[in-house]
Interface confidence: low
């Protein structure tokens, strides 16, 4: 999906509004510094694609995430203010729910959250000019 | 210990071009933007642009889109800003700084590299 | 274009307190940045997002910012903190945007 037509102001009132306070209640308990940010995006529908391959594509030691509270809130988020978005998402979900699994809060999940929040951070803070 | 180190001083004419490194050392290279930022004798500090490491983009500030070019070589954790059609004022001390991913400040120079433009 | 302005210089007496101030529209809703530089050498980070101080940067440096202005106050000054001044900030579509610098001279 090519996020360039998202309207990013009303994702980022999203994120301030709700998200990241779901960002930061899944890491309670967890130091600020116990991870290092290794994922990057230079500017926002980069970030956006980032963002979403690290919310809902299942990775190696962390399954879970697509249905966590932040994840919904972003997911309904894209679907609303990105024209076409719901669409591309249809058969990913349905797979989804096929693999439901036991939530599990694992370290690798926490890392991936961490990582998550730098991305929305660089989200609302832009080095590169919006094209 | 973390360090951005920069090549020597050069001495360039008027229509020429110059390529500076910045070899970074003691962290993860890919892990951070490096920036530029120049000062010319005696004036104030100017932000040139950025280059991320992790995928080679870049963003250059206005006033030198079209004559500034900046890359990186991550297997010697090197970055490169090269700097084209020079003029006088040009001559200037060219910094690299790492930013800081996570709040976007400037938390590590380079110790600069003069670059004379004369004919 | 983003414009930050700076005082060209501040004087001070050891142990009083230095502001420096930097303004800029609406200021406030950005983060801003300050950087000492001394003669010869390569600028330092003192501090971040308005009002953070990096490790290693005495508790004297502080830093403020709303409206249309940020200020870096040193309490205590030194005079080893004689050095020049920037503020620094993003902007959308100007990218990186220093001020012009302040000169603190310790009397």
């Known amino acids: 999906y090519d996020f360039t037509n998202c309207d990013f102001e009303k994702i980022k009132a999203a994120y301030l509004s709700t998200i990241s306070k779901d960002l930061i209640t899944y890491m309670s308990g967890t130091k600020s510094t116990e991870f290092n940010n290794t994922v990057s995006c230079s500017n926002r529908p980069h970030c956006l694609t980032e963002i979403q391959s690290l919310t809902f594509n299942p990775t190696a030691g962390c399954a879970s995430l697509a249905k966590e509270m932040f994840a919904m809130k972003t997911k309904a988020a894209l679907a609303i203010w990105c024209p076409g978005y719901s669409e591309t998402q249809i058969n990913a979900t349905q797979a989804m729910k096929k693999r439901r699994k036991r939530k599990v809060t694992t370290n690798k999940c926490l890392e991936q959250v961490s990582q998550l929040q730098g991305l929305w951070r660089r989200f609302n803070r832009p080095l590169l000019k919006q094209q | 210990q973390v360090q951005l180190v920069q090549s020597g001083a050069e001495v360039k004419k008027p229509g020429a071009s110059v390529k500076v490194s910045c070899k970074a050392s003691g962290y993860t290279f890919t892990g951070y933007y490096m920036h530029w930022v120049r000062q010319a004798p005696g004036q104030g500090l100017e932000w040139m642009g950025w280059?991320?490491?992790?995928?080679?983009?870049?963003n250059y500030g206005q006033k030198f889109q079209g004559r500034v070019t900046m890359t990186r070589d991550t297997s010697i954790s090197t970055a490169y800003m090269e700097l084209s059609r020079l003029r006088s004022d040009d001559t200037a001390v060219y910094y690299c700084?790492?930013?800081?991913?996570?709040?976007?400040?400037?938390?590590?120079w380079g110790q600069g590299t003069m670059v004379t433009v004369s004919s | 274009s983003y414009e930050l302005t700076q005082s060209p210089s501040v004087s001070v007496s050891p142990g009083q307190t230095a502001s420096i101030t930097c303004s800029g529209d609406?200021?406030?809703?950005?983060?801003a940045f300050w950087y000492q530089q001394k003669p010869g050498q390569s600028p330092v980070l003192v501090i971040y997002?308005?009002?953070k101080r990096p490790s290693g940067i005495p508790e004297r440096f502080s830093g403020s910012n709303s409206g249309n202005t940020a200020t870096l106050t040193i309490s205590g000054t030194q005079a080893m903190d004689e050095a020049d001044y920037y503020c620094?900030?993003?902007?959308?579509?100007?990218?990186?945007?220093f001020g012009g610098g302040t000169k603190l001279t310790v009397l």
């Open positions: 997002q308005d009002s």
């Open positions: 280059i991320n490491p992790n995928n080679g983009g870049t």
């Open positions: 620094q900030a993003w902007d959308s579509s100007a990218g990186g945007v």
């Open positions: 609406k200021l406030g809703d950005k983060f």
């Open positions: 700084a790492r930013g800081n991913w996570n709040d976007d400040a400037f938390d590590i």
